[in-house]
């Protein structure tokens, strides 16, 4: 079953996906599509990378992470309720049926207009399923870049850890505490 991620209307959504290039600069094509991963390729492609860069994208979809080191996590800008659904991250490893496929479920909640303290309580209540809607700049990508090599079976664990660490950053930045 797919892992669930959440965001509010009007915010940016973040869907994690990672792989480790076999060697520096030896990138693998990746596609992101709306809808569960089919047998081949991605359906309803929203973004695609090749051996060097992002070579196709549609409005509001982009890679904010260090995709040349394997962080191909998708950012969806200014989400609406229509963005809810399953997204496929497909790492197109050369060879027959070698692709790694990840289905991620994005749940969009209506925006809440509430004072700051309530918003901080929401952060805590959503833990650990809260989706960060704010990146933390170059330091974050440098940290990712220095992670030890991982294999594809570890991606799901890494995604969960990253999501939780991003939440921790958001909680810290908002003044909330983690218990």
């Amino acid at each position: 079953s797919e892992v669930e991620y959440r965001a509010e209307v009007g915010q940016n959504a973040y869907l994690p996906c990672f792989y480790t290039p076999a060697a520096p600069g030896n990138l693998v094509p990746v596609c992101w599509g709306k809808g569960a991963c089919p047998v081949f390729e991605c359906g309803n492609v929203v973004l695609r990378t090749d051996e060097r860069d992002v070579n196709y994208w549609t409005s509001r979809y982009w890679l904010n992470g260090d995709f040349r080191k394997g962080d191909v996590s998708l950012t969806i800008e200014n989400v609406t309720l229509a963005d809810s659904g399953i997204y496929c991250c497909r790492i197109q490893i050369p060879g027959i049926m070698n692709d790694e496929k990840f289905n991620l479920k994005l749940v969009i909640k209506p925006a809440k207009v509430t004072p700051a303290p309530t918003r901080q309580r929401d952060f805590t209540a959503a833990f650990p399923r809260m989706l960060t809607t704010r990146g933390h700049g170059p330091a974050e990508t440098q940290t990712l870049g220095s992670l030890p090599d991982i294999n594809l079976t570890q991606i799901s664990t890494l995604a969960n850890e990253l999501r939780d660490s991003r939440l921790a950053n958001d909680l810290r930045d908002s003044g909330a505490t983690i218990r």
Epitope: P24, G25, E51, R52, D53, V54, N55, W57, S59, W62, L63, N64, G65, D66, F67, R68, T75, E77, P138, T141
Partner: antibody
Framework: QVQLVQSGAEVKKPGASVKVSCKAS????????MDWVRQAPGQGLEWLGY????????SYNQKFKGRVTMTTDKSTSTAYMELRSLRSDDTAVYYC?????????????WGQGTTVTVSS | SIVMTQTPKFLPVSAGDRVTMTCKAS??????VAWYQQKPGQSPKLLIY???NRYTGVPDRFTGSGSGTDFTFTISSVQVEDLAVYFC?????????FGTGTKLEIK
């Protein structure tokens, strides 16, 4: 040390072709992309395309597709850029530039430039 | 293709000044922006890569920052040898595009 040495200046007539060479030394030629960038007189920089010597893969700026071809000779560590059907607005300095993984494919070394003048 | 809008076109400076120039991408390019310096009759030189990383041997008075669509390049204390044209470039997606350049000139 890393060096990219380009061929000399060329004067061509409209409709002709030009082939510029870029000889690399001081690094493993096949490990880095070679991009080509041009600069018209008093103007900014414009990307023409790249070639990856290791696999021979190329990517060209759509604006030049059908007119530009990039090749390499691995035995001499030389990259070539050929531009066909030249027009007067192709008059520019043409640079080869090394795109490396560790600089995120920005250009850490540039050739000295080759001036191509297209004039009747 | 992604348009890189660079401002200002000209920047009058005196030695010791702190100067800042900006580049705005027409769509998000993550951190995939480089800054180059070009002096008359010379090839461009890489100063900053991946938005904020100083290239080897580049003095620490040169700094870059930003991500997404807005990028800034700063020289903390301009030296005479810094008089040149500075270009930003996105290398997120081909065709890779450059800003139109900012020329540093004496006040």
């Amino acid at each position: 040390q890393v060096q990219l040495v380009q061929s000399g200046a060329e004067v061509k007539k409209p409709g002709a072709s030009v082939k510029v060479s870029c000889k690399a030394s001081g690094y493993t030629f096949t490990d880095y992309y070679m991009d080509w960038v041009r600069q018209a007189p008093g103007q900014g920089l414009e990307w023409l395309g790249y070639i990856y010597p290791n696999k021979g893969g190329t990517s060209y700026n759509q604006k030049f597709k059908g007119r530009v071809t990039m090749t390499t000779d691995k035995s001499t560590s030389t990259a070539y850029m050929e531009l066909r059907s030249l027009r007067s607005d192709d008059t520019a300095v043409y640079y080869c530039a090394r795109g490396g993984y560790y600089s995120y494919y920005s250009y850490d070394y540039w050739g000295q430039g080759t001036t191509v003048t297209v004039s009747s | 293709s992604i348009v890189m809008t660079q401002t200002p076109k000209f920047l009058p400076v005196s030695a010791g000044d702190r100067v800042t120039m900006t580049c705005k991408a027409s769509q998000s390019v993550g951190n995939n922006v480089a800054w180059y310096q070009q002096k008359p009759g010379q090839s461009p030189k890489l100063l900053i890569y991946y938005a904020s990383n100083r290239y080897t041997g580049v003095p620490d008075r040169f700094t870059g920052s930003g991500s997404g669509t807005d990028f800034t390049f700063t020289i903390s204390s301009v030296q005479v040898e810094d008089l040149a044209v500075y270009f930003c470039q996105q290398h997120y997606s081909s065709p890779y595009t450059f800003g139109t350049g900012t020329k540093l000139e004496i006040k």
